[in-house]
C-alpha cells in the first residue's frame, strides 16, 4: 500500500521564497515519519527534510544548503523555502516515509511542482515577463 501525494503543478517565487504544500492520503498524527523535498526529475538533490516523532519536537533541516522550514498538518507537510535563486528553478518532488507504527510506508511518486524563481539572479540577465494568457 502506497501513500498518495498531491502537489501544485507550479508555484512562483517572486520574492525568492515559496511555500510548497505536500498533501498526503495518510494522517501523520502520532506517527514517526520522514518527509522530504527533492529537486530535479531524477530527485537527485534532497532539498529539505522534516522529521516527525510523536515524542519529540519536529526536526527540519537541509544538508544541501537550502534555507528551509517546515510546518506539519494532520495530512500535510508544508516546506517554506527562502533565499531561492533563479538557477534553482526546477521540478520539486515531495516524498514521505512512515517508519512507525508498522508497516513501513512510503509514497507513489508524485507529479511534482515546478518552482519558478523570479528575481535574485546569480548573474545579471535581461528580465522578460513571458507570454500573457491567450
Amino acid at each position: 500500500n502506497k501513500i498518495l501525494v498531491k502537489q501544485s503543478p507550479m508555484l512562483v517565487a517572486y520574492d525568492n521564497a515559496v511555500n510548497l504544500s505536500c498533501k498526503y492520503s495518510y494522517n501523520l498524527f502520532s506517527r514517526e515519519f520522514r518527509a522530504s523535498l527533492h529537486k530535479g526529475l531524477d530527485s537527485a538533490v534532497e532539498v529539505c527534510v522534516v522529521y516527525g516523532n510523536y515524542s519529540q519536537q519536529l526536526q527540519v533541516y537541509s544538508k544541501t544548503g537550502f534555507n528551509c522550514d517546515g510546518k506539519l498538518g494532520n495530512e500535510s507537510v508544508t516546506f517554506y523555502l527562502q533565499n531561492l535563486y533563479v538557477n534553482q528553478t526546477d521540478i520539486y518532488f515531495c516524498k514521505i516515509e512512515v517508519m512507525y507504527p508498522p508497516p513501513y510506508l512510503d509514497n507513489e511518486k508524485s507529479n511534482g511542482t515546478i518552482i519558478h524563481v523570479k528575481g535574485k539572479h546569480l548573474c545579471p540577465s535581461p528580465l522578460f515577463p513571458g507570454p500573457s494568457k491567450p
Epitope: P9, M10, L11, V12, Y14, K39, G40, L41, Y85, V86, N87, Q88, T89, D90, I91, S110, N111, G112, I114, H116, V117, S125, P126, L127, F128, P129, G130, P131, S132, K133, P134
Partner: antibody, heavy 125, light 107 residues
Framework: EVQLEESGGGLVQPGGSLRLSCAAS????????MSWFRQAPGKGLEWVSV???????NHADSVKGRFTTSKHNSKNTVYLQMNSLRSEDTAVYYC???????????????????WGQGTTVTVSS | EIVLTQSPATLSLSPGERATLSCRAS??????LAWYQQKPGQAPRLLIY???NRATGIPARFSGSGSGTDFTLTISSLEPEDFAIYYC?????????FGQGTKVEIK
C-alpha cells in the same frame, strides 16, 4: 515576430556526435522554459529535455548521459549536444517554448506555444 | 509515465462534417491536457490547452472537453486546411507525454 529556428541536423554514424541549435527571436530564452522534442519517421512526438529559465535541466531517460541541453542567453539560443548517437535517435528534432500564464495563486505552463520548424538527424552507417 | 491513447487512429471525413477525436489517459491528468495539430513537414501547432481553452488565433470551430482520464477534441465543421494529424499531450506530470495521434483524412 515570435519564432524559433533549429539547425545542426545531418547524417552521422552510430557513436558519433552532433550539436543542434535553436535560435529564438521575438522573446528571450533566458526567462522562458524551453524543451527539445523529437519525432521518429512516421511516429509520434517524444519529449527529450527541458531547460528552465535559471538553467536547470532535465532529460528523458532514453537520452540521459548522452545528451546535454544548454543555452547562451546573449545569443538567445538553446543547444542540444548529442553524443554516442544510436540508430534509434534518428528523428526530426524540434525545440519549443513552454507557454506560461496566470497569477501568483494559479500559475502554470499550458503547453508548447512556439515551435521551430525542426531539423533532421539521421544516425546510420 | 502517463500513457495517452488516442482513437480512432484514422478518421475519414468530408469537408463540412463534424470530427470527434478521443484521448484517454492511463491515470488522471486533471484538466492538464493540450491538443496539437500537425501537417506533413510542419511543426506541431498548439490548438487547445487545459482541456478546453483555445490557444491564440485558433478558430472557434475547434473545441475541447473532458477531465480526469477522458478527453475529446471536436471540430464542428471541417475546413480543407483541417486535414492533418492531431495529438493530445498531458502536462500533469513529467515527462510530458503525447498520444500516438489521430489522422483526419479526406474521405
Amino acid at each position: 515576430e515570435v519564432q524559433l529556428e533549429e539547425s545542426g541536423g545531418g547524417l552521422v554514424q552510430p557513436g558519433g556526435s552532433l550539436r543542434l541549435s535553436c535560435a529564438a527571436s521575438g522573446f528571450t530564452v533566458s526567462s522562458n522554459f524551453m524543451s527539445w522534442f523529437r519525432q521518429a519517421p512516421g511516429k509520434g512526438l517524444e519529449w527529450v529535455s527541458v531547460i528552465y529559465s535559471g538553467g536547470s535541466i532535465n532529460h528523458a531517460d532514453s537520452v540521459k548521459g548522452r545528451f546535454t541541453t544548454s543555452k547562451h542567453n546573449s545569443k538567445n539560443t538553446v543547444y542540444l549536444q548529442m553524443n554516442s548517437l544510436r540508430s534509434e535517435d534518428t528523428a526530426v528534432y524540434y525545440c519549443a517554448r513552454h507557454g506560461i500564464t496566470g497569477t501568483t495563486g494559479d500559475y502554470h505552463y499550458y503547453g508548447m506555444d512556439v515551435w521551430g520548424q525542426g531539423t533532421t538527424v539521421t544516425v546510420s552507417s | 509515465e502517463i500513457v495517452l491513447t488516442q482513437s480512432p487512429a484514422t478518421l475519414s471525413l468530408s469537408p463540412g462534417e463534424r470530427a470527434t477525436l478521443s484521448c484517454r489517459a492511463s491515470q488522471s491528468v486533471s484538466s492538464y491536457l493540450a491538443w496539437y495539430q500537425q501537417k506533413p513537414g510542419q511543426a506541431p501547432r498548439l490548438l487547445i490547452y487545459d482541456a478546453s481553452n483555445r490557444a491564440t488565433g485558433i478558430p472557434a470551430r475547434f473545441s475541447g472537453s473532458g477531465s480526469g482520464t477522458d478527453f475529446t477534441l471536436t471540430i464542428s465543421s471541417l475546413e480543407p486546411e483541417d486535414f492533418a494529424i492531431y495529438y493530445c499531450q498531458q502536462r500533469s506530470n513529467w515527462p510530458p507525454t503525447f498520444g500516438q495521434g489521430t489522422k483526419v483524412e479526406i474521405k
